[in-house]
């Protein structure tokens, strides 16, 4: 019988997708030769016994967006050949026991986005072909010993975004497959030490958007082939020495969000595939020599939106292929001149919105490559003669909102940005501050050969009248990813937000970090 | 002389929206920082936002964020809060206050007389 | 970064030396200010940077500390200082104010 029920479209005979609110139970009768189903979008509530009982070839099953509660223990009976059931984005609360029974070739569960408060391991007990096990947005509270102990298959596991609260050390301890394992988004506050152990082959780990404090010293030293570890906001106070010691393969690692006071010398390492290095939103207050030392291939280091108000003059040693340093929205009021003479490749520097009186002449020495440089919302006043008289690929460079002191030592800045205008973008261009009869006029445009002598300008001045003067125009369901690019510039947009952490919800495309790297 | 006066106070219901201008005078507009500090009735200070000489950056207390936007208009003189989502914790006098530089400092040297934000069903 | 003013008021009579203490929960260099506020009146500047007296501010007021610890003093007190002062701090976003000392008159 190879007739299409009339709720339904047949595209080929083995293919039918069952979509419309019109919909209230399972059509039928299903071409007896479908290898596909697809029931989308419809009011039903419950599932009975058998509804596919004459569709034994069935391979993939998805029965998604609908109105379900309730599931007959018999229904999926005579399923044999299934191997993808995707019952995501309904409204179960329970699975009866025995419901997966007979579904020996299943090989992906999705059961996200329901309402369950429990899984026991009877409901997974014959699926040792089983590679790929959604169980994210729902309501467990609670994994008991032994659920997964089946699955000795299983490669993905996804258990985000619920309400679990504490993990046993054991639950894991059987699935010496698994690559990628997701707790994002849960009320975890702390994971026993031992509970990854048995996961050798984990290549991701997923623990953003938790409640961690504290991480065991031995955490991952099981888990060797790990490639990405997301562990931003949680409330992680310090990092144990050596935590990412048996760590190799790293090659992405978040801690933005949590409340990392200071990173001491050889926490990070070794780890020569680490890319990236996001630590935004924590409250490291300094930086001391050789922090990141190990770090040889790192590219991007977000240090934004701390509380950094010293850097050793090594704490960059070793970072020889960073591309894009991100300090701004800090307490910075100095560096030392030699602090990113090791940065040999560096193109992005952001030092927006920190405290800087003055900068080194010889700041950016070795840094050639700079193309952008965010040095706006400083308290600069002025800045040394040549200090950017030898990046020759410098094309963005912002210097608005500094308090600049327009006398006679200006003259060297006044005349690089003459020469280099276009670098400084069209929209905001630096002023004067001081002296007050210069105030709001454009440091390039101003003459400065009339404007006062160099002198001791108070470093807040009373605030007489003046007139006036010309106004001279930073896989879905993970957030852990970033919109914007760690040299974004943020106009009108609040700088404190500057790596905006977007939330993904489909589980079934690519994880990227931003747009471009997602490929 | 420099002056700051605030406008746009007013009773709103809950989840309602206000926006409160500060018309300044007296002084360079677009080389300070400006601020909103807020009072609740008998209560201490509170800072809610800042933003910079330019408009390039801005700041906000954690309890306003996504719920207000700062704003200036430098060829108007004119600072602004947007305030949407609004909440009864978010009734208080609300001053717009003038940095004594173009960064953003939390330093004020002059302050408006004050809006009256009222916020109840 | 919470700010802890103490006393939460005092009593204190003219020509008294007064001492208003901040305490910060992390360190924040000299990034604080000391504002002073009259019923019905908008917050005064007195001192920034910790210890820098703003300009038109009577020389009696000053300020001191660095890190956690602050103080405003007021050598010698005048009726035109009895006020609610407060500490702020913008080292560290969001900026956060004290909960205010209260200097009355002695009675």
């Known amino acids: 019988y190879y007739g299409c029920p009339s709720e339904c479209t047949c595209s080929r005979a083995s293919q039918v997708e069952c979509t419309g609110a019109r919909i209230v139970a399972v059509p039928a009768p299903l071409p007896w030769n479908a290898m596909s189903l697809q029931i989308l979008n419809t009011h039903i509530t419950e599932l009975n016994e058998s509804p596919f009982l004459n569709i034994s070839a069935l391979i993939a099953l998805r029965i998604e967006k609908n109105e379900l509660s309730h599931i007959m223990p018999g229904a999926f009976r005579n399923l044999g050949s299934l191997r993808y059931l995707s019952l995501a984005n309904n409204k179960l609360q329970v699975l009866p026991i025995g419901l997966f029974q007979g579904l020996n070739n299943l090989e992906s569960l999705l059961l996200s986005s329901n309402q369950l408060v429990q899984i026991q391991p009877a409901h997974f007990s014959q699926f040792s072909n089983l590679k790929e096990l959604q169980l994210h947005g729902n309501h467990l509270e609670y994994i008991p010993d032994g659920v997964f102990d089946h699955l000795v298959g299983l490669t993905k596991l996804n258990l985000g975004k619920n309400s679990l609260t504490h993990l046993s050390p054991r639950i894991f301890q059987r699935l010496g497959n698994l690559q990628v394992l997701r707790l994002y988004e849960n009320r975890l506050s702390e994971i026993p030490m031992g509970t990854f152990d048995g996961c050798g082959n984990l290549q991701e780990l997923a623990l953003q958007q938790n409640q961690i404090g504290m991480l065991s010293p031995g955490l991952f030293h099981n888990n060797r082939n790990l490639q990405k570890l997301y562990l931003s906001n949680n409330h992680i106070s310090q990092l144990p020495p050596g935590i990412f010691m048996q760590l190799p393969q790293l090659n992405r690692l978040t801690l933005f969000g949590n409340s990392l006071k200071e990173l001491s010398p050889g926490i990070f390492g070794p780890m020569h595939n680490l890319r990236e290095l996001w630590l935004y939103d924590n409250h490291i207050t300094s930086l001391p020599d050789n922090v990141f030392s190990n770090l040889h291939q790192l590219q991007v280091l977000i240090l934004s939106r701390n509380q950094i108000n010293y850097i050793s003059p090594d704490a960059f040693n070793g970072l020889v292929e960073l591309r894009e340093l991100s300090l701004h929205t800090n307490a910075l009021q100095e560096l030392d001149g030699s602090v990113f003479r090791m940065l040999v490749n560096l193109q992005n520097i952001s030092l927006q919105n920190n405290r800087l009186r003055q900068l080194p002449g010889n700041i950016f020495a070795n840094v050639n490559g700079l193309m952008t440089i965010q040095l706006q919302n400083n308290q600069l006043e002025n800045l040394p003669m040549g200090i950017f008289d030898h990046l020759g690929n410098l094309c963005e460079l912002r210097l608005y909102d500094n308090p600049w002191r327009c006398d006679s030592d200006i003259l060297p800045l006044h005349n690089w940005l003459l020469l280099n205008k276009p670098r400084l973008g069209t929209d905001t261009l630096p002023v004067c501050f001081s002296p007050p009869s210069v105030r709001g006029q454009s440091l390039i445009i101003i003459n400065v050969n009339v404007a006062v002598p160099s002198v001791q300008v108070p470093m807040i001045p009373e605030v007489p009248s003046y007139p006036e003067t010309p106004q001279y125009p930073d896989t879905p369901s993970f957030p852990d990813t970033t919109s914007v690019s760690t040299t974004e510039f943020t106009s009108p947009v609040e700088d404190y937000t500057d790596l905006t952490t977007i939330e993904v919800t489909d589980d079934r495309s690519t994880w990227g970090m931003t747009q471009a790297q997602s490929g | 002389q420099v002056q700051l006066l605030e406008s746009g106070g007013g009773l709103v219901q809950p989840g309602g929206s206000l926006r409160l201008s500060c018309a300044a005078s007296?002084?360079?507009?677009?080389?300070?920082?400006m601020s909103w500090v807020r009072q609740a009735p008998g209560k201490g200070l509170d800072w809610v936002s800042v933003i910079s000489g330019t408009g390039g950056s801005t700041f906000y207390t954690d309890s306003v964020k996504g719920r207000f936007t700062i704003s200036r208009d430098n060829s108007e003189n004119t600072l602004y809060l947007e305030m949407n989502s609004l909440r009864a914790e978010d009734t208080a006098v609300y001053f717009c206050?003038?940095?004594?530089?173009?960064?953003?400092?939390?330093?004020?040297?002059?302050w408006g007389q004050g809006t009256l934000v009222t916020v109840s069903s | 970064i919470v700010l802890t003013q103490s006393p939460s008021s005092l009593s204190a009579s003219v020509g008294d030396r007064v001492t208003i203490t901040c305490r910060t929960s992390q360190v924040i260099r000299n990034d604080l200010g000391w504002y002073q506020q009259k019923p019905g009146k908008a917050p005064k500047l007195l001192i920034y940077d910790a210890s820098s007296l703003q300009s038109g501010v009577p020389s009696r007021f000053s300020g001191s500390g660095s890190g956690t610890d602050f103080t405003l003093t007021i050598s010698s007190l005048q009726p035109e200082d009895f006020a609610t002062y407060y500490c702020l701090q913008d080292n560290n976003y969001p900026w956060t104010f004290g909960q205010g000392t209260k200097v009355a008159i002695k009675r």
């Open positions: 206050a003038k940095a004594v530089t173009v960064n953003t400092r939390g330093f004020f040297d002059y």
């Open positions: 007296g002084f360079t507009f677009s080389t300070f920082a």
